[in-house]
């Protein structure tokens, strides 16, 4: 708290300008009118106020707007946004995408702070769903944003928004998240032709079921190994050697390097060794010729 002291003669601020950087904390408190500050918030960011000076300016706004700042002030907070607590932000009603962009710009290039996370949460909840423009904006500032959402939160993403998603936005998504996103992507891209469809759907395939992988194997897609390694193990296991060969095309040779890793390792264990041998890659560990798998869960073999 800054002590209430009278403003020295001739120091009363008539406008928010650069001369204020020479004011001490108590002078800012005494000589800057909160209403003037609120109407000239757009000027604050143009002036190099220190951490301590911003504290005083925030205090003045808090006194003027105890129930939360109006959006006209929020949009122009600039670096003052960094002084806000999540509790402050929860009092706000941010509806404009321009306001969101302006505040995200302040923290650009830095990790998502609790303030930013709260702001985004407030904004998205206010909109009711994560629409395309919002998703576009958020992933531009935070490529990992989508993967920070729970599967429940992702369920509110409309398929139309999927067009805004770039491959790098999904880098940190886990299988549970891709399970939610994949059907939306499939719906979003359903009217595209084969090769274009594959380019778009590729980064979502970690959520694809077996039947969709089988369908893709019929389309000469030449899936790369990096994508294959991200597929759900339970979706890969039922694929035949012929289907995997068609799915990977020329990339099938890469299976050898990955034979000890999932899902390749588990898939190999499910294939007949003579089928694996047809690939000519030297993959070992398949079911020996003449053996029959009766219990898939235990993989007991009888001669």
């Amino acid at each position: 708290e800054v002590e209430k002291t009278a403003c020295p003669s001739g120091k009363k601020a008539r406008e928010i300008d650069e001369s204020l950087i020479f004011y001490k904390k108590w002078e800012l408190e005494a000589c800057v009118d909160a209403a003037l500050l609120a109407t000239q918030m757009d000027r604050v960011n143009a002036i190099p106020f220190t951490y301590e000076q911003l504290d005083v300016l925030k205090h003045k706004l808090d006194e003027l707007y105890p129930q939360g700042y109006p959006e006209s002030v929020i949009q122009h907070l600039g670096y003052l946004f960094l002084k806000m607590s999540p509790e402050d932000i929860r009092k706000w009603n941010v509806t404009s995408l321009e306001t969101l962009k302006a505040l995200l710009e302040v923290n650009k290039g830095h990790e998502m702070s609790p303030q930013v996370a709260t702001l985004i949460d407030r904004f998205v909840k206010g909109r009711g769903q994560l629409d395309k423009d919002t998703l576009d904006t958020l992933t531009a500032f935070y490529p990992g944003y989508l993967c920070s959402l729970s599967p429940e939160e992702l369920s509110s993403v409309p398929p139309s928004s999927i067009w805004a998603v770039r491959p790098q936005d999904l880098d940190t998504c886990d299988p549970r998240q891709l399970d939610v996103l994949y059907p939306k992507a499939r719906l979003a891209f359903q009217n595209m032709n084969g090769s274009e469809y594959f380019v778009k759907i590729q980064s979502f395939l970690g959520g694809a079921p077996t039947e969709d992988l089988k369908a893709l194997s019929q389309q000469n897609v030449s899936m790369d190994l990096a994508t294959f390694m991200k597929l759900r193990t339970d979706a890969v296991l039922p694929l035949t050697v012929a289907e995997v060969q068609k799915l990977l095309g020329p990339h099938v040779e890469g299976l050898k390097a990955e034979e000890r890793h999932r899902p390749v390792r588990d898939w190999i264990l499910r294939q007949r060794q003579d089928d694996l041998d047809t690939l000519g890659l030297g993959l070992q560990g398949g079911i020996p010729n003449g053996y029959l798998v009766l219990d898939l869960s235990m993989q007991e073999a009888l001669s």
């Epitope: 143009a46 002036i47 190099p48 951490y51 960094l82 290039g109």
Partner: nanobody, 114 residues
Framework: VQLVESGGGLVQPGGSLRLSCAAS????????VAWYRQAPGEQREPVAA???????IYADSVKGRFTISRDNAKNTVYLQMNSLKPEDTAVYYC??????????WGQGTSVTVS
């Protein structure tokens, strides 16, 4: 954000120095910036500032002697100090934008006028 100040040193009264401050990213090209100084036992105080629009302002004690400028291409801010006095002795810092608001400072560069 990294701020690296340089150019300080020992100088005789009446002499000149040019301080430089380099920042990572494109921090200085888009933000208001300022030079500050801290004399031994004193609080850090602003000496010169440049708004994001390019206008400049100086503390009364350095007016007419110090000039702040910036090179956006090099992402560097300068402080040209002429007619130096013993009372200008201090550690000089530059800052602006995100790091200033977050209270992150560089190591500063020491100026001694003697």
């Amino acid at each position: 954000v990294q701020l690296v100040e340089s150019g300080g040193g020992l100088v005789q009264p009446g002499g000149s120095l040019r301080l430089s401050c380099a920042a990572s990213g494109s921090m200085f090209s888009i933000n208001a910036v300022a030079w500050y100084r801290q004399a031994p036992g004193e609080q850090r105080e602003p000496v010169a500032a440049m708004t994001s629009g390019g206008s400049t302002i100086y503390a009364d004690s350095v007016k007419g002697r110090f000039t702040i400028s910036r090179d956006n291409a090099k992402n560097t801010v300068y402080l040209q100090m002429n007619s130096l006095k013993p009372e200008d002795t201090a550690v000089y810092y530059c800052n602006g934008g995100w790091s200033l608001a977050m209270n992150y400072w560089g190591q500063g560069t020491s100026v001694t006028v003697s």
